[in-house]
């Protein structure tokens, strides 16, 4: 990563816990927490005090004095108190509550369904390409290439279970060794963490909300990347995962069992199957090198078919291919035998939207990608608004206390491990870590779950998805049982190893600090979130893959200098932060470099320039949409987009402290103020506050 000083805003002290959360987060009493903050030298630091010149804290923290953006917000109850309501009001309030709960479940259902459709869309767009990545066996023997193939394929198909099943098939048919499969599994683990990062992008409307949501989502990414950074070289050197899983398989004689219950799929499938159904075997066939599969469509057309097994006379190369002499004969030239030929007869077509469209996979994929992202975004906004209106006052306090409070001393350390178990259990129930972490993201954003609590839940989710894979492996047929089980166990032990590395000791909880740093940068420069996503999940893996195609010498020749440079920057950063006095004056900060090399400000200016042009065209449409929304919501004082005004006017507004958002790369400033007096008769969910930064509305 570039040595951007914005990163310095990451919480440097792992011992510093969330202040807003009730309960004993640390041994320091709440009122003394402010006083207890210290800088490097151990001297107290007030929040308003500027840290030494080597810190860039001031660049990020735009919040008012005395507040920490990482504090969980106090969700105040803006409505009328229960005791002050009359019978009619109370009845209405109960109906509103029930209505909100039903709406919340409805939007949550749509949210999960849209994630499923999003996965299908990604498979339609990139599934065949993903399959082709696997078909290059020579590259996959290179662990680094294997890793990036795992990342790319899982990002492309939006499903680690799909990529895992391809790997299992390849191992079972000896196209791939378990040794070569392990880095791919590691890559698949990274790839699966993109989903909740995409979901977090949808919360970019409110800076602090986005800060928390994006950090909460990327804590998963950082955990996976850091785990791979340590465990991939370790595995390449020692093959400990391969040896350990072999040992487990030999020690315990595994029998075929039952697959994990698909609780969530049972609910979502009836709806998603009306939208699209895919034939996942096509990707698998491409991966296995079946050239005929390249021309097949991923879209399932026939859902009901009968298989006729008929005895047919077929020619075979020689009598060696005969089942027995009784079933073999010759016509004088060729040897014939009787074989059971399975013929598939299609009976009924599938019942999804695209079944009768003769559109190519790419077109259907793009349509579904667009629609699912819009629905995902809309659902997320509505979930956030609903949760925001429901989680107020006492309810919020209880939930926040339950989720973020540690066990009493001396068992406080156990809380995180319980959270890991909860995360694993929840993921096991919903059968998808993507769904669980994505559903958690808005809760982190609105401040119901802290990053510190989200971290073990996410780690648990990683474990949960591997236990699901182990059960799926146990349910697989005999010929693939061993290979699928070994791969599932590799996945499991990889995550266990990662947890042992980055969780037990608070100091090693590096993903939290890195995620917070990224959250801070992304809150200030929202375009950076998109850059991060593209750079880490597409550009870097594709570059490494490209270099792998060129061969080991090229990969090492290009990779080693980059890694050395990164290590140099990291060491220098550590010295600047820990003991700047040993460094020459010039190296105590990054000012010796051109501004664009150590600050995102110049880049922000460039991106702002590029997006202003696009924004001006788009903003009038935004304003119309915004007004329509206001009418639908019934907000009397809804404030619509100011983006059609002159830039100068906006600057004045900002200076006057009017709460209109800056025209950042993503801003719409749509519906930016909630009508406080509206809350009495309105269903609060519809009195929208800062609906979204995206251009959905």
């Amino acid at each position: 990563m570039a040595p951007w000083p914005e990163l310095e805003n990451a919480q440097p002290n792992p011992g510093k816990f969330i202040e807003g959360a009730s309960g004993p987060q640390s041994s320091i009493p709440a009122k003394d927490k402010e006083a207890s903050k210290t800088n490097d030298n151990g001297t107290p630091v007030a929040k308003t005090e500027l840290l030494p010149s080597y810190s860039a804290l001031v660049l990020i923290e735009e919040h008012p004095e005395g507040t920490d953006p990482w504090d969980l917000p106090e969700l105040q109850d803006t409505g009328i108190k229960w005791s002050e309501r009359d019978t009619k009001g109370k009845t209405l309030c109960i109906f509103q509550g029930v209505g909100k709960f039903i709406l919340l479940l409805g939007f949550l259902y749509l949210f999960v369904c849209s994630l499923d459709v999003l996965s299908s869309a990604f498979q339609l767009v990139g599934g065949k390409v993903a399959g082709q990545f696997f078909s290059n066996n020579s590259i996959m023997s290179n662990p680094v290439a294997g890793l990036v193939i795992g990342v790319l394929v899982t990002v492309m198909v939006q499903s680690s279970s799909t990529s895992s099943s391809i790997i299992v098939s390849m191992v079972a048919s000896s196209l791939l060794t378990v040794r070569a499969a392990i880095p791919i599994i590691m890559g698949a683990n990274i790839g699966t963490s993109i989903t909740n990062t995409i979901v977090a992008l949808m919360q970019a409307g409110d800076r602090n909300e986005f800060r928390r949501a994006f950090a909460g989502a990327t804590v998963h990414d950082f955990f996976n990347w850091l785990s791979v950074f340590v465990l991939l070289p370790l595995e390449a050197a020692t093959h400990y995962l391969e040896i350990l899983t072999n040992l487990v398989l030999e020690t315990f004689k595994f029998q075929n069992g039952e697959d994990a219950p698909d609780i969530l799929k049972v609910i979502t499938d009836p709806f998603t199957k009306l939208i699209i159904q895919l034939d996942k075997k096509v990707i698998q066939q491409i991966a296995m090198g079946d050239s005929a599969a390249q021309n097949k469509s991923l879209i399932k057309i026939w859902c009901k078919s009968i298989t006729n097994v008929t005895e047919m006379n077929v020619t075979v190369p020689s009598t060696d291919n005969c089942t027995s002499p009784s079933y073999c004969w010759t016509d004088g030239i060729q040897t014939w035998t009787i074989q059971n030929v399975t013929q598939k007869e299609n009976i009924a077509k599938c019942q999804h939207i695209f079944v009768n469209f003769s559109l190519p996979d790419l077109a259907v994929g793009i349509i579904l990608l667009t629609v699912s992202l819009v629905v995902l975004c809309g659902c997320l906004i509505m979930i956030v608004k609903l949760l925001g209106s429901v989680l107020r006052g006492q309810v919020a306090t209880v939930i926040k206390k339950t989720l973020n409070t540690d066990f009493p001393f001396p068992f406080a350390w156990l809380t995180g491990y319980l959270a890991i178990l909860v995360g694993a259990g929840m993921t096991f129930i919903v059968q998808s870590s993507s769904v669980f972490t994505s559903a958690m993201t808005p809760l982190i954003g609105i401040g119901v779950i802290s990053i510190e609590r989200a971290y073990p839940l996410t780690l648990g989710s990683n474990i949960g998805t591997t236990t699901t894979a182990i059960l799926a492996a146990l349910a697989s047929p005999g010929n693939t049982l061993r290979s699928s089980l070994q791969i599932a166990l590799c996945h499991f032990f990889f995550n266990i190893s990662g947890i042992l590395l980055w969780y037990p000791i608070p100091f090693t909880r590096l993903p939290i600090r890195l995620a917070k740093g990224l959250g801070n940068i992304s809150a200030k420069y929202r375009w950076f979130a998109v850059f991060y996503l593209i750079f880490f999940f597409f550009v870097t893996p594709l570059t490494v893959f490209g270099l792998s195609l060129a061969g080991w010498p090229v990969l090492v020749g290009v990779g080693v200098p980059i890694i050395l440079l990164l290590l140099l920057v990291l060491c220098l950063r550590m010295l600047q932060f820990r003991c700047p006095r040993i460094l020459p004056l010039k190296l105590r900060d990054w000012n010796f470099l051109p501004l664009w090399m150590h600050s995102l400000k110049p880049w922000d200016n460039v991106i702002s320039l590029a997006t202003t042009c696009f924004q001006r065209r788009c903003c009038c449409c935004c304003r119309v949409c915004c007004r329509v929304c206001c009418m639908v919501c019934g907000c009397k004082c809804c404030r619509c987009s100011k983006c059609c005004r002159d830039q100068g006017e906006e600057e004045e507004e900002k200076e006057q402290d009017i709460p209109v958002k800056a025209s950042g790369a993503f801003d719409n400033a749509a519906m930016s103020k909630e009508c406080q007096d509206e809350g009495k008769g309105q269903v609060e969910v519809l009195s929208m506050k800062a609906l979204s930064n995206t251009t959905v509305f």
Epitope: N313, S324, P325, C328, W329, T330, D331, G332, I333, T335
Partner: antibody, heavy 119, light 107 residues
């Protein structure tokens, strides 16, 4: 109806070659194998080999390998069997027979061609 | 090569008799056996294939049975035109081979 008409009787000297033809009609020539079977005077039937006119693929009895050549002319729906290095024991009636599709039973036979080898 | 041994080599019977000709294979040939009838100076004529299936146009008095190594051709009621030489043939593997023949004569 299916008909197999063979060429006339031949008298050959030892060491010479003989080429017997078998003209077919009444069915699709390229779908069935054509077999050649011989019968020495007062003896049983002996399989020489077969040809698949569709591709020209052949299979010969090991006993005749190197001496026998079978060819097919799809334009005239005719098959040929050439036997070289003739010996007196090659004196026999040579039959062409159509093989049933997918197995080695022979359903239609030519009238036979007598080849006499004598010095 | 697979050897086929027919028995008897000669058989005398009267019109109306039930006649059975057997054919033994030196190894398992499944059901890949055919039966032919040949009259003097004529080409053989297919009677039975797949050990039991009658060829089109063959009278129902002709029937075949057996599998593996033992096969039989049965003529349920001999007719004057049935006096001829009968051959069995295996097509289990190359080269195709024939039995030495069974000559059926009038008693």
């Amino acid at each position: 109806q299916v008909q197999l008409v063979q060429s006339g009787a031949e008298v050959k000297k030892p060491g010479a070659s003989v080429k017997v033809s078998c003209k077919t009609s009444g069915y699709t020539f390229t779908t069935n194998n054509m077999h050649w079977v011989r019968q020495a005077p007062g003896q049983g039937l002996e399989w020489i080999g077969a040809i698949y006119p569709g591709s020209g693929a052949t299979a010969y009895n090991q006993k005749f390998k190197g001496r026998v050549t079978m060819t097919a002319d799809t334009s005239t729906s005719t098959v040929y069997m050439e036997l070289s290095s003739l010996r007196s024991e090659d004196t026999a009636v040579y039959y062409c027979a159509r093989g049933m599709y997918g197995h080695g039973a022979m359903d239609y036979w030519g009238q036979g061609t007598l080849v006499t080898v004598s010095s | 090569d697979i050897q086929l041994t027919q028995s008897p080599s000669f058989l005398s019977a009267s019109v109306g008799d039930r006649v059975t000709i057997t054919c033994k294979a030196s190894q398992d040939v499944g059901t890949a056996v055919a039966w032919y009838q040949q009259k003097p100076g004529k080409a053989p004529k297919l009677l039975i294939y797949w050990a039991t299936t009658r060829h089109s146009g063959v009278p129902s008095r002709f029937s075949g049975s057996g599998s593996g190594t033992e096969f039989t051709l049965t003529i349920s009621s001999l007719q004057p035109e049935d006096f001829a030489t009968y051959y069995c043939q295996q097509y289990s593997s190359n080269p195709l081979t024939f039995g030495q023949g069974t000559k059926l004569e009038i008693k």
